[in-house]
Interface confidence: low
Amino acid sequence: DAHKSEVAHRFKDLGEENFKALVLIAFAQYLQQCPFEDHVKLVNEVTEFAKTCVADESAENCDKSLHTLFGDKLCTVATLRETYGEMADCCAKQEPERNECFLQHKDDNPNLPRLVRPEVDVMCTAFHDNEETFLKKYLYEIARRHPYFYAPELLFFAKRYKAAFTECCQAADKAACLLPKLDELRDEGKASSAKQRLKCASLQKFGERAFKAWAVARLSQRFPKAEFAEVSKLVTDLTKVHTECCHGDLLECADDRADLAKYICENQDSISSKLKECCEKPLLEKSHCIAEVENDEMPADLPSLAADFVESKDVCKNYAEAKDVFLGMFLYEYARRHPDYSVVLLLRLAKTYETTLEKCCAAADPHECYAKVFDEFKPLVEEPQNLIKQNCELFEQLGEYKFQNALLVRYTKKVPQVSTPTLVEVSRNLGKVGSKCCKHPEAKRMPCAEDYLSVVLNQLCVLHEKTPVSDRVTKCCTESLVNRRPCFSALEVDETYVPKEFNAETFTFHADICTLSEKERQIKKQTALVELVKHKPKATKEQLKAVMDDFAAFVEKCCKADDKETCFAEEGKKLVAASQAALGL
C-alpha cells in the first residue's frame, strides 16, 4: 500500500527511538570509518526531517524514497573521497544504482581497532552520565564492524546491553555481575552476525530461490504441524524481511519483521504449539524468541513420502505443472519428517530429486526411471553422519583447543594460500562445533553441526572474496551453496603449493605474551602453528605436535623467568633452531 511519504510512514510505525537507532545502524553499516559524532549528527538531521514529514506528508522532499533521502545524506559527508576512496564515486550515480554501489563497498573485515573493554567503573560512570549516548555508541561500534548484522536483532541486543548495565552498575560486585553478561552478549552477537551473513550471502550470491528453499526446509522442521500453504506464506514474508535487511532497507525490514511476528502469534494455532511463551513477550523479545523457538512435535500419522513422490502416476504431471511448487512440497514433506537432518542435507536431497525428475520425466518410461530415487539418498545421508561421528570422537579425545589445532593443520594444508589470521579465525570457529554440537544426542547432532559449519565456512568465503588468493576456495564457495562443506571436506593437501620462505621474525616472541588472556595466548600459538604448516606443508602430525609442545614449554618457562624479555630472546633462538631441525627446514 502506497504512502505519500515513506519516511513519515516508517517513523510512525517504528516510533522515534527505533527509527533513530535503525538509521544509525544503517549509516554505520555503510560508512564504517566515519566517527561516531558525524553519524549522530546525520541521524539527528534525518530524524528532524522525518518529523516535518509526519506533520505534513506533502512537505518538500517528503515524497522521496528512503534510499534517495539516506543516500543524499551520506553523500554530504565532507571526507568521503579521502576516507573511502572509490566509494565516493557512488555519489555520482542515481538510485537504485547508488544504493547498490554502497552495498558493494560494505567491508566484512574493516580496518578498525579491536574493541577494548574499559574497566567496569569507567563503563558504569559513562552509562550513568549519558545513557543515550552510551547505547548509541554500542549500536555504532557493532554495526560498523558487522555491516550485515540483522538490524532488528541488534535492537534486541542493545536492549539486553542496557538491562545488564542498569542491573549491574548498582550491584555490590559490579564486575562479577556485568562481565559474564557482556561476554555472553559478545559471543551471541558474533554468532548472530555470522548467521545473518550467511542469509545475505545466500540471497545475494545464489538468489531468492536458494534462500526460499533454505527457509522452506528450516520452517518445515520447526513447524511440522503447519500445512504447506502456511509454511509458504511464512517463507514469502521471511524472504521479504531478509531481502530488505540485506539490502540496507533497515526501516522496512524492522517494520515487516514486527508484522511477521504479529501474524505468527495471531495464527499460532495453525503454525506451532511451541509459540505460546514467545508470543507473550514484548516485540523485540518476541521476534527473537520466535526465531529461536524449538521444533514442534511431528504429527503422529504422517504417511509415507513414496506414495506422492515416487509411486504416484502423477509425479511428472505435477512436476511439469509447477516445478518449484512440487519441489517445495517435496522439501516441506521431507523436512517435517526429518528434524534430525541438517537443512543443507535436506536441500541436497531435494536437488537430487529435482535432477532425477528432470532426467526421468523426459524418458520413455518415467516411473521405471525414478522408481529408485530414494535409494540415491542413502549415501548423501551417511556422509555427514559419518563425518560428524569421526569428528566428535576426535573432539572428545583431544578437547577443544587441540581439536582446533587439528583443524588448523587440516585446513592450512588444504588451502595454504589463505591469510594466516583468516585460517586461525575460521579454524577456531570450526573447532567450536565440538563443544557446541557433540554433547547432543544423535538426533540433534547433524542439524547442529552441519548447519553451524555452513555459517563458519561462509565466513571463510566472504573474507576470501575480499582478497581472493585460492582457486580452490573460490570454487568451493561459488559452485553450490549446499555443497560448500562437502567440497571443503573433499579437498586434499594442495600439492601445487610452494612452501613459504622461513622467516625467523614470524617465530620471535616477547614478554607481552605473558600478560595475554588464555584465549589470546592460544591465538598466538595457533598463528605460529599455521605459519609452521605453511613453511613445511608435508610435516607430519607427530613433528608438528613435538614443535608445539616445545613452544608451549618455552612460553611457560619464560613467563616464569625473572628477566622475561632476555629469556624470550635467548630461548627463542634455540627454539627456532630446534624447530627447524625437527621439521627439516
Epitope: 500453504a229 502456511e230 509458504s232 514469502t236 509447477a322 511448487v325 512440497m329
Partner: nanobody, 126 residues
C-alpha cells in the same frame, strides 16, 4: 487492494448443478491464490476448493472431490466453481477469497486470505 464479487447462487434440487462466478478487480486473478469457502447456518467457514497463483494446481475438500471443479478465466479475471451432484448438505453461503503475492499454493485456512467477497447463497432442497 482486491475487490471480489460473487454471483450464480440460487435454489437447486438435489442432484442438480450450479456454476458460481467470482469477478475480481484491482489485481490480476492469475497472480493470486484464490479459493472458495462456504458457511452453513450456525457453522464456521469451511474450505471448499482452491487454485494457486500463477499455476493451475487445484485443491479440494474431501467432501466435494469429484463433484466440484474450480477453474479461472484469466482473460475475464474471473474465478468459477462448477458444482454438480449437489446435496442438501451443500447448502451454505459461498464466499470467494484471495491471497495476493503470487503464492503458488492455496490454503485451507480462512485467516490466510485477506480479501473476501460478500458471498452468494446456495440452497439445495426439493
Amino acid at each position: 487492494e482486491v475487490q471480489l464479487l460473487e454471483s450464480g447462487g440460487g435454489l437447486v434440487q438435489p442432484g442438480g448443478s450450479l456454476r458460481l462466478s467470482c469477478a475480481a478487480s484491482g489485481r490480476y486473478i492469475d497472480e493470486t491464490a484464490v479459493a472458495w469457502f462456504r458457511q452453513a447456518p450456525g457453522k464456521g467457514r469451511e474450505f471448499v476448493a482452491g487454485i494457486g497463483g500463477g499455476v493451475d494446481i487445484t485443491y479440494y475438500a474431501d467432501s466435494v472431490k469429484g463433484r466440484f471443479t474450480i477453474s479461472r478465466d484469466n482473460s475475464k479475471n474471473t474465478l468459477y466453481l462448477q458444482m454438480n451432484s449437489l446435496r442438501p448438505e451443500d447448502t451454505a453461503v459461498y464466499y470467494c477469497a484471495a491471497r495476493p503475492g503470487r503464492p503458488l499454493i492455496t490454503s485451507k485456512v480462512a485467516s490466510l486470505y485477506p480479501y473476501w467477497g460478500q458471498g452468494t447463497l446456495v440452497t439445495v432442497s426439493s
